[in-house]
């Protein structure tokens, strides 16, 4: 057992950052940690538990943004983020860090929360050493943070399990002297197998050689992920070493409990009952002091490890632990065929052309403001505005110069031309009508119109 | 400090026209929406129409529709309300109002109002 | 457009009484409602939005509830502060409606 301690030095913007804090317009706001930590190196899905524990930080001063002025530093909260672990330090994790913004003062329809930054680190650390300090950018915004794994009396060493235990001061020496001042002595750490990792390896038995997450092997020499056998599922296969074919990850149920599993490529997935945590759902005894609520929510009750906590989700998310995001856009908020967009902190819909509001419940007056040019005239409808050209001008607003007999109307090798009130058609022998539409009968009556009087085939037709 | 300030009282003869002015101060202009309501003496309140000073999108309630012209001017952060041909039924409170850009937000911050007087 | 019916029109009741206003709207309007107080010769001032959701700095004895068509602004223990008109609103739909609005005065 032992603690992971974390402590943010400063967050602000990175060289070369946005100049706007992140609370410009939105009053007064105060910033908020939450660490996460997953055993092991492997790309883990974000919504994935944070199995080694989890903590939330105080709420920082509060922090009113200057008009104009380049964003600082900003405000931290006060104090190390510490969180728990009551098994082996597995010496190889991930560790999230999200940065969170409390929005103080009026809400306009959000949540009060809304998530700034998101850095994971992927790193192996011994526990019981130095503080390791590092810089990471997240955007526009830079964090610089430290960090250290120590162990709990009575466990010690770098991965927090070899024992010490206080030396007996009952045991006097001959002559009935007093014992010596109490001391703590450590237990001589068992003999590991020969040839053991020092760095990746342990033991908590004589001869036994137990591998840290991320190593395998007889003497935890072999990263994991360099096997070539990864993914595969099943029972060792004694000629090859590899896995083979078997029981899918959920056979036999890993979750404790009463924990529902559930498959996830190459491995699986528990979901706990309250009061239960971990990759297995095998611990029990979490408080809000732990920091069990994801993405912002609020923990309640929970005081002590007997009272179960509750986590209250902010919106957008579910789940015990508030671990799972839900489709907001499922309830399809956006009318008029917008798009809905989830932001995180609160929905917003893209609407169409021809529509705006919040959910793009309004029609535009497609023609409100704006003119067609060059004697055209809006027309309203159909989603966007729409301007009817004058002749010899076209485009969205009238303002290019139009070929008007580029379109071709006259059917049937009919030439064009402009006039000055219209289009005109001079039709082909054999072809009459506005577009030379319609073949002249060989004797002189057309098919259907009737030609309009004093106008005969071949004669110029004028289009409307 | 969310405000929204318009401009003072008007009396008007009917058929001439009318502008109120709303400057906003305290938050970003080009985020929101701006809604123009009117309240007739004793009365509930109307809608009349929104304009998106982001991209200028307008959308005016049918019945004010030929007779009300909304406009912004982002550089002042001001919006505007012009109704002509004015008739003695128009004479209201105008209020303009603000919306937020998410599908939550309803409007929440109101100017102090306009009294326009339409009288021969 | 929706149509939006408030009942009562005017109400009397004592400091301390819990008081109850009720909106309908002609059509679902799922829960895009918002309620405004206003108080005489002054600008509406926003309550609830979301239908049941108040804007910070509202004190909580004012509460909404609702879904649909029907709708309720609950205030628990009515204070002399609280004498004004509210006002029920459906923001679901363009063009934006308010109901005729409850008096709420002090016996």
């Known amino acids: 057992a032992g603690v992971f301690e974390l402590q943010i030095h400063s967050f602000g913007p990175g060289p070369g950052g946005a100049p706007r804090s992140p609370y410009s317009a939105r009053g007064p706001c105060r910033l908020f940690f939450r660490v996460c930590l997953k055993p092991g190196l492997s790309e883990e899905a974000a919504e994935s538990p944070c199995a080694l524990g989890a903590a939330l930080s105080a709420r920082g001063p509060v922090y009113t943004e200057q008009p104009e002025a380049p964003a600082p530093d900003l405000p931290l909260p006060n104090g190390l983020l510490q969180v728990p672990f009551r098994d082996a330090w597995p010496g190889t994790f991930s560790l999230i860090i999200e940065t969170w913004r409390e929005e103080l003062g009026d809400q306009i329809g959000g949540p009060a929360w809304s998530l700034l930054a998101r850095v994971t680190r992927r790193r192996r650390l011994a526990a019981g050493g130095p503080w390791a300090g590092d810089i990471q950018r997240a955007g526009a915004w830079e964090l610089r943070f430290s960090y250290r794994a120590r162990c709990e009396l009575p466990a010690v060493g770098t991965a927090c399990t070899r024992l010490c235990r206080p030396r007996s001061a009952s045991r006097c020496g001959p002559g009935l002297r007093p014992c010596a001042p109490l001391e703590d002595e450590c237990e001589a750490p068992p003999v590991c197998r020969a040839g053991c990792s020092l760095e990746h390896g342990f033991c908590e038995q004589p001869g036994e050689c137990r591998c840290l997450e991320g190593w395998t092997g007889p003497l935890c020499m072999v990263p994991v992920s360099t096997s070539s056998c990864l993914g595969l599922r099943g029972p060792s296969s004694t000629t090859t070493g590899c896995l083979v074919p078997g029981p899918g990850p959920c056979d036999g149920n890993p979750c404790a409990n009463g924990g529902s599993c559930s498959e996830t490529p190459g491995s699986f997935e528990c979901t706990c009952p309250r009061g239960f945590y971990g990759l297995r759902c095998e611990v029990s005894g979490v408080t809000c002091a732990d920091g069990p609520c994801f993405n912002g929510g609020l923990c309640v009750g929970g005081a002590d490890p007997d009272s179960a906590y509750i986590c209250h989700c902010p919106p957008g998310f579910q789940g015990s632990n508030c671990e799972k995001r839900v489709d907001r856009c499922s309830l399809q908020p956006c009318r008029n065929g917008g798009l809905c967009l989830d932001l995180g902190h609160a929905l917003r819909c893209r609407c169409r052309a021809g529509f705006a509001g919040p959910r793009c419940e309004h029609d535009l007056n497609d023609c409100a403001g704006r003119a067609c040019a060059n004697g055209g005239t809006c027309v309203e409808g159909g989603g966007a505005h729409r301007c009817s050209c004058a002749l010899g001008f076209g485009g969205r607003d009238c303002r290019e110069r139009a070929d008007p007999c580029a379109a071709r109307p006259c059917a049937h090798g009919g030439r064009c031309y402009a006039h000055f009130s219209g289009l005109v058609c001079a039709c082909a022998p054999g072809y009459m009508g506005a577009r030379c539409e319609f073949p002249v009968h060989p004797d002189g009556v057309s098919a259907l119109p009737a030609a309009p009087p004093g106008l005969r085939p071949g004669d110029p037709q004028r289009y409307p | 400090e969310v405000q929204l300030v318009q401009s003072g009282a008007e009396v008007k003869k009917p058929g001439a026209s009318v502008k109120v002015s709303c400057k906003a101060s305290g938050f970003t202009f080009t985020d929101y929406y701006m809604h123009w309501v009117r309240q007739a003496p004793g009365q509930s309140l109307e809608w009349m129409g929104l304009v998106y000073p982001y991209n200028g999108d307008i959308s005016y309630a049918q019945k004010f529709q030929g007779r009300v012209t909304l406009t912004v001017d982002t550089s002042i952060s001001t919006a505007y309300m012009e109704l002509s041909r004015l008739r003695s039924d128009d004479t209201a409170v105008y209020y303009c109002?603000?919306?937020?850009?998410?599908?939550?937000?309803?409007?929440?911050?109101w100017g102090q109002g306009t009294l326009v007087t339409v009288s021969s | 457009d929706i149509q939006m019916t408030q009942s009562p029109s005017s109400l009397s009741a004592s400091v301390g009484d819990r008081v109850t206003i009720t909106c309908k709207a002609s059509q679902n309007v799922g829960n895009i409602i918002a309620w405004y107080q206003q108080k005489p010769g002054k600008s509406p001032k926003a309550l609830i939005y979301l239908a049941s959701y108040r804007y910070s700095g509202v004190p909580s004895r004012f509460s909404g509830s609702g879904s649909g068509t029907d709708f309720t602004l609950t205030i628990s223990s009515l204070q002399p502060e609280d004498v004004a008109t509210y006002f029920c609103?459906?923001?679901?739909?363009?063009?934006?409606?308010f109901g005729q609005g409850t008096k709420v005065e002090i016996k």
């Open positions: 609103q459906q923001y679901s739909d363009s063009p934006y409606t």
């Open positions: 109002a603000r919306q937020g850009n998410y599908v939550n937000n309803a409007i929440d911050y």
